[in-house]
């Protein structure tokens, strides 16, 4: 079942996911896919990157985070109800199918009429390390036998390090959106 | 114009080994994945092998194989050629086919969007 | 593996009348993954339809796709001669990509 994310219309969502490159610049080909995985690549393909850098993406939708280190996390502009589905990100690991894929459904709240904008400048300022910090929270590792030097971290799961911790209700309640950058 | 020509199809012994190939033009090879089809005589048809497009170097690919031929086919790409190949080996009569390369469209229908003309193997003693 | 049964094998039709062939999965398959593909004798397939209902380039307009979950068809709102062929269905919802076994469609 997929992991649920929220965002206020509006605001820009997130979709995290991750992986560690084998070394520094040795970079996996990931696309990103409005709609649940198929069997190759992503359908409806809305941002793709190559061994060396992000060769195709369409508006609203750009990674914020440094992919060249394997946060290859979706940053969804400006959102609106439409927005709402479920995504995929697949991280296309080389080999007899190595690849990766991960659902991520986002769901879009219609805008709240006063949004509370300094906790929401708190929450930004906040969560980014936490973001992007392989160690936080629950993780699992998948060592791939026929690429033994990649190690795949799935830290797709946001909701994960946030669902036990009082500020996950509290965003969760506000309505806020975590907003990178 | 988008084109996808097969060749290196023929008769064969069974166990015996074959290596088809597929030469696209009009359009970016390394861009696409590319899957191998297969119909036999008078039947339906028969998806056997993709490896993904996207990469830099035609090693790092992604592969899947249809479980009939794991093992036996193996499929790969030159993308400075812009060509596709099946290295087919122990040869059985049941793949005795008619083989098809077809492009993966990512960008627009992302599916099965062209493809050749077919290359005919028969495997037969 | 999903397994896509098409029906009926094989069938006629007398031009101007309304055609459906269907496609049955054994197990649900998503809508943007249900392809169908035209094959004439001595040709490659064509794609036809993408997406349940979305014709590929160049389809005439009396072509349409539907459905969800296990149950998809096409169909042609007035048969013409051109459209005799072969017909097949295609998920690629799930590992491995499957065909149906085909329709072929015949002119009276």
């Known amino acids: 079942s997929e992991v649920e994310y929220r965002a206020e219309v509006g605001q820009n969502a997130y979709l995290p996911c991750f992986y560690t490159p084998a070394a520094p610049g040795n970079l996996v080909p990931v696309c990103w896919g409005k709609g649940a995985c198929p069997v190759f690549e992503c359908g409806n393909v809305v941002l793709r990157t190559d061994e060396r850098d992000v060769n195709y993406w369409t508006s609203r939708y750009w990674l914020n985070g440094d992919f060249r280190k394997g946060d290859v996390s979706l940053t969804i502009e400006n959102v609106t109800l439409a927005d709402s589905g479920i995504y995929c990100c697949r991280i296309q690991i080389p080999g007899i199918m190595n690849d990766e894929k991960f659902n991520l459904k986002l769901v879009i709240k219609p805008a709240k009429v006063t949004p509370a904008p300094t906790r929401q400048r708190d929450f930004t300022a906040a969560f980014p390390r936490m973001l992007t910090t392989r160690g936080h929270g629950p993780a699992e590792t998948q060592t791939l036998g026929s690429l033994p030097d990649i190690n795949l971290t799935q830290i797709s799961t946001l909701a994960n390090e946030l669902r036990d911790s009082r500020l996950a209700n509290d965003l969760r309640d506000s309505g806020a959106t975590i907003r990178i950058g | 114009e988008v084109q996808l020509v097969e060749s290196g199809g023929g008769l064969v012994r069974p166990g015996g080994s074959l290596k088809l190939s597929c030469v696209v033009s009009?359009?970016?090879?390394?861009?696409?994945?590319m899957h191998w089809v297969r119909q036999a005589p008078e039947k339906g048809l028969d998806w056997i092998a993709y490896?993904?497009?996207?990469?830099?170097?035609?090693?790092?690919?992604?592969?899947y194989y249809a479980d009939t031929v794991k093992g036996r086919f193996t499929i790969s790409r030159d993308n400075a050629k812009n060509t596709l190949f099946l290295q087919m080996t122990s040869l059985r009569s049941e793949d005795t086919a008619m083989y098809y390369c077809?492009?993966?469209?990512?960008?627009?229908?992302?599916?099965?969007?062209?493809w050749g003309q077919g290359t005919s193997v028969t495997v037969s003693s | 593996q999903i397994v896509l049964t098409q029906s009926p094998a094989i069938m006629s039709a007398s031009p101007g009348k309304k055609v459906t062939l269907t496609c049955s999965a054994s197990?649900?398959?998503?809508?943007?993954?249900l392809y169908w593909y035209q094959q004439k004798p001595g040709s490659s397939p064509k794609l036809w339809i993408y997406?349940?209902?979305n014709l590929a380039s160049g389809v005439p307009a009396r072509f349409s796709g539907s459905g969800s979950g296990t149950s998809y068809s096409l169909t042609i709102s007035s048969m013409e001669a051109e459209d005799a062929a072969s017909y097949f269905c295609?998920?690629?919802?799930?590992?491995?990509?499957?065909f149906g076994g085909g329709t072929k469609l015949e002119i009276k």
């Open positions: 197990s649900s398959v998503s809508s943007s993954y």
């Open positions: 009009g359009f970016t090879f390394s861009d696409y994945g």
């Open positions: 997406s349940t209902s």
């Open positions: 295609l998920q690629w919802s799930s590992y491995p990509p499957t």
């Open positions: 490896i993904s497009g996207g990469s830099i170097s035609s090693g790092s690919s992604t592969i």
């Open positions: 077809a492009r993966h469209d990512w960008r627009g229908l992302y599916a099965m969007d062209y």
